[in-house]
């Protein structure tokens, strides 16, 4: 159905291609987790990565970049 | 239960100016997405703009930028929409919407019950 | 500006049909997209949220379909209180822009 699993961790990269529906599970989740790309209007929301949607929840989350922490990529990893 | 209670109806002069309030009970008003959406007599649905969370500030459609400032008193829960440069187009019923969200403006979950606004000489 | 256009702008119906109302994005929304009813001197009231999700206390005659561009409000046994005008709305992008309406009178 064009949904793909992948780990929701901050690893640099957005679950699936561009637009497309995906999952994600952690070893503590039970259940599939499951995202979306964000609306446009979040376009500027992670302030140093990527953008996905939990469609459950109609909520926007972060992938950061390497270096960067926070619900919206907006802290810098000092230690990094 | 989320209550959004508007001021009543005004009838404004052409080029003036008018505020319309909208306060919420029931919820915590601060986390939660205003929008301002106004109905034409006889006519559709049409978003003005609204206070996006995420942001901690307000975002307008192009059509009424810079006539229309859109606030919010968390220490009253009200918002507020003012609409300047009245003209007898603007004549319409205002409504302040709640957006679903604590982060952007989704879907408008909870409505005011309107005001009319009549714009004549 | 995301353009909505929904059909038809009205139509008329009997107690117990299925209505099928039709919304269609000028670009693709996912599923970033809203259903409303609005009665006369009423604010709107919410039915569908994110294109296929039942609103909390909205009868289940009412469902939402589609993705993309393409969307459907179905109401699967129409009743007396149904008839109303049916607005969708779009959230991907600002401006949230509305269709025009389906206004939903009795044959």
């Known amino acids: 159905d064009g949904n793909t699993t992948r780990t929701p961790e901050t690893n640099g990269s957005l679950c699936g291609a561009p637009g497309e529906n995906c999952t994600g599970t952690t070893p503590r989740q039970k259940s599939k987790t499951h995202f979306s790309r964000c609306p446009k209007q979040y376009k500027h929301y992670c302030i140093h990565g990527r953008c996905r949607f939990v469609m459950d929840e109609q909520t926007p989350s972060c992938i950061c970049e390497k270096g960067y922490f926070g619900a919206r990529c907006e802290q810098v990893d000092l230690f990094y | 239960q989320v209550q959004l209670v508007q001021s009543g109806a005004e009838v404004k002069k052409p080029g003036s100016s008018v505020k319309v309030s909208c306060k919420a009970s029931?919820?915590?008003?601060?986390?939660?997405?205003i929008s301002w959406v106004r109905q034409a007599p006889g006519q559709g649905l049409e978003w003005m703009g609204g206070?996006?969370?995420?942001?901690?500030?307000?975002v307008y459609a192009q059509k009424f930028q810079g006539r229309v400032t859109i606030t919010a008193d968390e220490s009253t829960s009200t918002a507020y929409m003012e609409l300047s440069s009245l003209r007898s187009e603007d004549t319409a019923v205002y409504y302040c919407a709640r957006s679903s969200s604590t982060y952007g403006i989704h879907a408008f979950d909870y409505w005011g019950q309107g005001t009319l606004v009549t714009v004549s000489s | 500006d995301i353009q909505m256009t929904q059909s038809p702008s009205s139509l008329s119906a009997s107690v117990g049909d299925r209505v099928t109302i039709t919304c269609r994005a000028s670009q693709s929304i996912s599923n970033f997209l809203n259903w409303y009813q609005q009665k006369p001197g009423k604010a709107p009231k919410l039915l569908i949220y994110a294109a296929s999700n039942l609103q909390s206390g909205v009868p289940s005659r009412f469902s939402g379909s589609g993705s993309g561009t393409d969307f459907t409000l179905t109401i699967s046994s129409l009743q007396p209180e149904d008839f109303a005008t049916y607005y969708c709305?779009?959230?991907?992008?600002?401006?949230?822009?509305f269709g025009q309406g389906t206004k939903v009178e009795i044959k």
């Open positions: 206070i996006v969370p995420w942001m901690g500030e307000a």
């Open positions: 029931g919820g915590t008003f601060s986390s939660y997405a």
């Open positions: 709305q779009q959230y991907d992008d600002f401006p949230m822009t």
